[in-house]
């Protein structure tokens, strides 16, 4: 299921980097969130629950990330013009069933004021 544009602020700039916010419903207990740049997987984070409700967080493509009860934030640093692209949050829901995949995204515009280490 492709939902198109995120209906929230997906990109938060700070210190020459960007926080990309991937939201999900707080009812979701087990999932995989991938950050795509165009069609390429940049980062992923998988949250699963084992016996006794022990939570496991795994990443196959590791980025600096932050997990809350309704979002995963991925952090990209040292921005330059090559970072300008479409970015998508690809959410795969395992629990609650049934399995669902949903894609939301937006275009990351890079302006001079947001670049790292600008030459004065």
């Amino acid at each position: 299921e492709i939902n198109g544009s995120a209906n929230y602020e997906m990109f938060i700039f700070h210190n020459g980097g960007v926080q990309i916010l991937c939201k999900y419903p707080d009812i979701v207990q087990q999932f995989k969130m991938q950050l795509l740049k165009g069609g390429q997987i940049l980062c992923d984070l998988t949250k699963t629950k084992g016996s006794g409700n022990t939570v496991s967080i795994k990443s196959l493509k590791f980025c600096h990330s932050q997990l809350s009860n309704n979002s995963v934030s991925f952090f990209l640093y040292n921005l330059d013009h090559s970072h300008a692209n479409y970015y998508f949050c690809n959410l795969s829901i395992f629990d609650p069933p049934p399995f669902k995949v949903t894609l939301t995204g937006g275009y990351l515009h890079i302006y001079e004021s947001q670049l790292c280490c600008q030459l004065k």
Partner: antibody, heavy 125, light 108 residues
Framework: EVQLVESGGGLVQPGGSLRLSCAAS????????MHWVRQVTGKGLEWVSA???????YYSDSVKGRFTISRENAKNSLYLQMNSLRDGDTAVYFC???????????????????WGQGTTVTVSS | EVVLTQSPATLSLSPGERATLSCRAS??????LAWFQQKPGQAPRLLIY???NRATGIPARFSGSGSGTDFTLTISSLEPEDFAVYYC??????????FGQGTRLEIK
């Protein structure tokens, strides 16, 4: 008119097999998660099995390992292969569909809004 | 497994009266509850989803409320065609999907 039509029910001996079918029309079958729900005469509703839009399958403990659910989106069809049938499987079997939509932080469940008329399965020697 | 307990088992009322049916869940299911009506020899019909949303084509006299573990289906003024069996159902903590045992609404 949106409809589901079940077929394949009948009389079968304990240990036997049946294959139920459910044909859908007038709605976008591929967007629905599909279920089989059964009802013993005069009793309540019992969920049997489900298959998601991605083909993921789910079963009640009472039929796990004996029943297999499948779907063929190109034919707008749902199936339930029932093996090793028992007396306790005697019931009217309904196929039904529901939808879950995820948008950002919202998780919408729209309920089982399409149902077939049911097909009767009788397991008896 | 989420157990749904409906009460009363049978409700005897007259046309024009108000009917209040209850469904209690054994654990928090938020608002992921549906209500169905079933008449003899027919398939169930979805009345309410998401605890309080009327399904397409359902008359305004049917309303649902509640969240968490306690839910209510209200029929504001009973019509003759409303006498049937009513089931609640959850599909958030599953498998299995579970139904309540049903409330039979009969004419007094």
């Amino acid at each position: 008119e949106v409809q589901l039509v079940e077929s394949g029910g009948g009389l079968v001996q304990p240990g036997g097999s049946l294959r139920l079918s459910c044909a859908a029309s007038e709605f976008i079958f591929s967007t629905y998660d599909m279920h089989w729900v059964r009802q013993v005469t005069g009793k309540g509703l019992e969920w049997v099995s489900a298959i998601g839009t991605a083909g993921d399958t789910y079963y009640s403990d009472s039929v796990k390992g004996r029943f297999t659910i499948s779907r063929e989106n190109a034919k707008n069809s749902l199936y339930l292969q029932m093996n090793s049938l028992r007396d306790g499987d005697t019931a009217v079997y309904f196929c039904t569909g529901d939808r879950t939509v995820v948008r950002g932080v919202n998780y919408y469940y729209y309920g089982m809004d399409v149902w077939g008329q049911g097909t009767t399965v009788t397991v008896s020697s | 497994e989420v157990v749904l307990t409906q009460s009363p088992a049978t409700l005897s009322l007259s046309p024009g009266e108000r009917a209040t049916l209850s469904c209690r869940a054994s654990q928090n299911i938020r608002n992921y509850l549906a209500w169905f009506q079933q008449k003899p020899g027919q398939a169930p019909r979805l009345l309410i989803y998401g605890a309080s949303n009327r399904a397409t084509g359902i008359p305004a006299r049917f309303s649902g409320s509640g969240s968490g573990t306690d839910f209510t289906l209200t029929i504001s003024s009973l019509e003759p065609e409303d006498f049937a069996v009513y089931y609640c159902q959850q599909r958030i903590n599953w498998p299995p999907i579970t139904f309540g045992q049903g409330t039979r609404l009969e004419i007094k």
